[in-house]
């Protein structure tokens, strides 16, 4: 029987800066029940805090609501593992909520072939922000990236979209099912998981791109 | 713990190249930005380049612009400084440097490692 | 380039003294965020630089309270209120708000 092995913070995640949470990972337990308090302080304040929430996030993990999240303000975070043998830390997390949104997939993902009288056919792809992202307050600027392949193409062609929420595609392979996702990602931030996937059929008269 | 170990440093001759690396433990790589930074013989310390944690944006000030480049890969928890072209006044000391900073660009150097010396001499 | 000038380059000082380093930057290092990317490291002999101060006034880790930074814009101060035989060692600024980034010269911290 032993103190508690090292635990480590390894991520932590906002849907939207107005709310985040972080994981961590316990080290070996040393055989005896442990607890886990994962405790933090904002940059210029020597007053510690106790997490506010241990359940939203799942086990070992941390969830800081909206009355408890600043952008632009460094939390500094540590977790103690404790059992009836000693204690152990964790190394100290400096985190920034602005840097680590992560954005809900785009939504409402549409996709249909315009064949033009006059013009060359093409994919149009349309999408939806994610519900909890809020553009209108100029916080957030939202990157967007399309993938798609036929359905036994084992390679994903790629584009990057911009902040823009529609898409034109000209180049596609007459007869054949596509799928096509969408993802977003913030000017500061990760990816987003890819939207699920929707799935056109290209008409065997669609004519190919010069 | 987070250790920083660089290695790859020696002498080499004047427009002569090299290959710094920086192995990495103790915290989640792929997470952080990076940095070399160099101490000349005099002492004074200057900033090299840094990198963004996927490895997808890098910058380097004028001096070692378009001679060196900087590199992760995320996968073997390692950075790499290679430098070609090298002149005399490269000689120095590199450190490489985690932020302090879980992910975003900016922010301090909060660890270093214990530096690898390069000297360019004919 | 922000040109970040220190000042004095040698600080002989007595153990249990106060001691007070200038760092002045060229231009205002004010980030288009609002934040103020000033830092001060410690490069004792033989050693790699550690981090002290991280945004003009944020002590690192481990850091004891006898030091503190401050200033703003362009003009900014660290105090190690009581020098202890630990802290002797060369100090330097950093400005990290533009790139590139840049160190000032250095300030030796020498028992007089």
């Known amino acids: 029987q032993l103190p508690p092995g090292k635990p480590e913070i390894f991520k932590c995640r906002s849907p939207n800066k107005e709310t985040f949470t972080c994981w961590w990972r316990p080290g070996t337990d040393g055989g005896l029940p442990t607890n886990y308090s994962l405790t933090y302080h904002r940059e210029g304040e020597t007053l510690m805090h106790e997490c506010p929430d241990y359940i939203t996030g799942g086990p070992n993990s941390c969830h800081f609501g909206k009355q408890y999240t600043s952008m632009w303000r460094t939390y500094i975070m540590m977790v103690n593992a404790t059992n009836q043998m000693g204690s152990s830390f964790s190394d100290e997390l400096y985190v920034d909520v602005t840097y680590i949104v992560q954005p809900d997939p785009p939504l409402e993902l549409a996709v249909e072939v315009k064949q033009p009288e006059d013009r060359k056919p093409y994919l149009w792809i349309k999408w939806s922000p994610p519900t909890l992202i809020d553009l209108k307050t100029g916080w957030f600027t939202l990157l967007y990236e399309i993938r798609l392949k036929p359905e036994k193409a084992a390679e994903w062609e790629i584009h990057f979209a911009g902040q823009q929420t529609e898409f034109k595609i000209l180049s596609l392979h007459p007869g054949q099912k596509y799928l096509v996702q969408v993802r977003c990602k913030p000017d500061h931030g990760y990816w987003s998981a890819w939207s699920p996937a929707t799935f056109i059929q290209i008409p065997s008269d669609f004519t190919m791109n010069d | 713990e987070v250790k920083l170990v660089e290695s790859g440093g020696g002498l080499v001759q004047p427009g002569g190249s090299l290959k710094l690396s920086c192995a990495a433990s103790?915290?989640?790589?792929?997470?952080?930005?990076m940095f070399w930074v160099r101490q000349t013989p005099e002492k004074s310390l200057e900033w090299v380049a840094y990198?963004?944690?996927?490895?997808?944006?890098?910058y380097y000030p004028d001096t070692v612009k378009g001679r060196f480049t900087i590199s992760r890969d995320n996968a073997k928890n390692t950075l790499y400084l290679q430098m070609s072209r090298l002149k005399s006044e490269d000689t120095a000391m590199y450190y490489c440097?985690?932020?302090?900073?879980?992910?975003?660009?900016?922010?301090?150097?909060?660890?270093w490692g214990q530096g690898t010396s390069v000297t360019v001499s004919s | 380039d922000v040109l970040m000038t220190q000042t004095p380059l040698s600080l002989p000082v007595s153990l249990g003294d106060q001691a007070s380093i200038s760092c002045r930057s060229s231009?205002?290092?004010?980030?288009?965020?609002?934040?103020?990317?000033l830092e001060w490291y410690l490069q004792k002999p033989g050693q790699s630089p550690k981090l002290l101060i991280y945004?003009?006034?944020n002590r690192f880790s481990g850091v004891p309270d006898r030091f503190s930074g401050s200033g703003s814009g362009t003009d900014f101060t660290l105090k190690i209120s009581r020098v202890e035989a630990e802290d002797l060692g060369v100090y330097y600024c950093?400005?990290?708000?533009?790139?590139?980034?840049?160190f000032g010269s250095g300030t030796k911290l020498e028992i007089k």
């Open positions: 945004k003009v006034s």
């Open positions: 103790g915290f989640t790589f792929s997470d952080y930005y």
């Open positions: 231009q205002s290092i004010v980030h288009s965020n609002g934040n103020t990317y």
């Open positions: 950093f400005q990290g708000s533009h790139v590139p980034f840049t």
């Open positions: 440097s985690r932020q302090l900073f879980y992910y975003g660009s900016r922010g301090a150097m909060g660890y």
């Open positions: 990198i963004s944690n996927g490895g997808g944006s890098t």
